[in-house]
């Protein structure tokens, strides 16, 4: 019997300081560029090595960005979202959604080293 894949969804506020070359990440998504099926949200597609986001360490590829400096990213064209980040100022507050994949074993299964066995 195969395990079931579940997702643990958490939200976090991440405050970044714009570095010499900006925020240091790429995005996909938007109403005109749906990267995830049936979801026009904005997602992190790449984090630049040694950029501001990478040095902070909390933002991850695959994270969904819900807001920038309190401004909701719902129903935005892709380029409008890009421009929002580029014009967000020196101190940038991101509300992000992390989606962690969790592998669940079959019901009733106990691992070999399970102390409750």
């Amino acid at each position: 019997m195969n395990g079931r894949v579940d997702y643990l969804v958490t939200e976090e506020e991440i405050n970044l300081t714009r570095g010499p070359s900006g925020l240091g990440f790429n995005i996909v998504g938007g109403t005109d560029q749906q990267y995830v099926s049936n979801d026009s949200g904005i997602y992190v597609s790449r984090i630049k090595e040694n950029g501001a986001a990478a040095l902070d360490g909390r933002l991850q590829e695959g994270d969904k960005i819900l807001s920038v400096n309190g401004q909701d990213l719902k129903n935005l064209l892709h380029q409008d979202a890009v421009d929002l980040f580029r014009n967000a100022g020196y101190a940038v507050s991101l509300r992000v959604q992390h989606r962690l994949q969790v592998q669940n074993g079959p019901i009733g299964h106990r691992g070999e080293g399970d102390p409750s066995g």
Epitope: P20, S21, G22, L23, G24, F25, N26, I27, V28, D32, Q33, Y35, V44, S45, R46, K48, E49, N50, G51, H78, Q79, V82, F85, R86
Partner: nanobody, 127 residues
Framework: DVQLVESGGGLVQAGGSLRLSCAAS????????MGWFRQAPGLERDFVAE????????GYADSVKGRFTISRDNAKNTVYLQMNSLKPQDTAVYYC?????????????????????WGQGTQVTVS
Amino acid sequence: DVQLVESGGGLVQAGGSLRLSCAASGRTFSSYTMGWFRQAPGLERDFVAEISWNGGSTGYADSVKGRFTISRDNAKNTVYLQMNSLKPQDTAVYYCAAVIGSPTDSSDYRSSLDYDYWGQGTQVTVS
């Protein structure tokens, strides 16, 4: 992943024109930001031009503004660099590059570290 193959390089006289092409393989080409870089012997790979996923936004190095034009055809999975008024200092190997998504940083700061996928390059020589 994306594979990139450049073509269109060659020898041209100063003041002449060339059009470089970069053919990309990959199903999600339209989600990629595409760029051109160049590298002269003994020098670093320098940013030349960049185009957004749908062609709506472009950026250029100061040294090529007004002379070079970047464009793309997502139906053909191809990006182009039209180079006019070529100068001897434009002589270099020209590389096509791709990265998934759109950088949230202005192209004023673009470097080779911003791109993940590269072609093998095509030589442009201006005499």
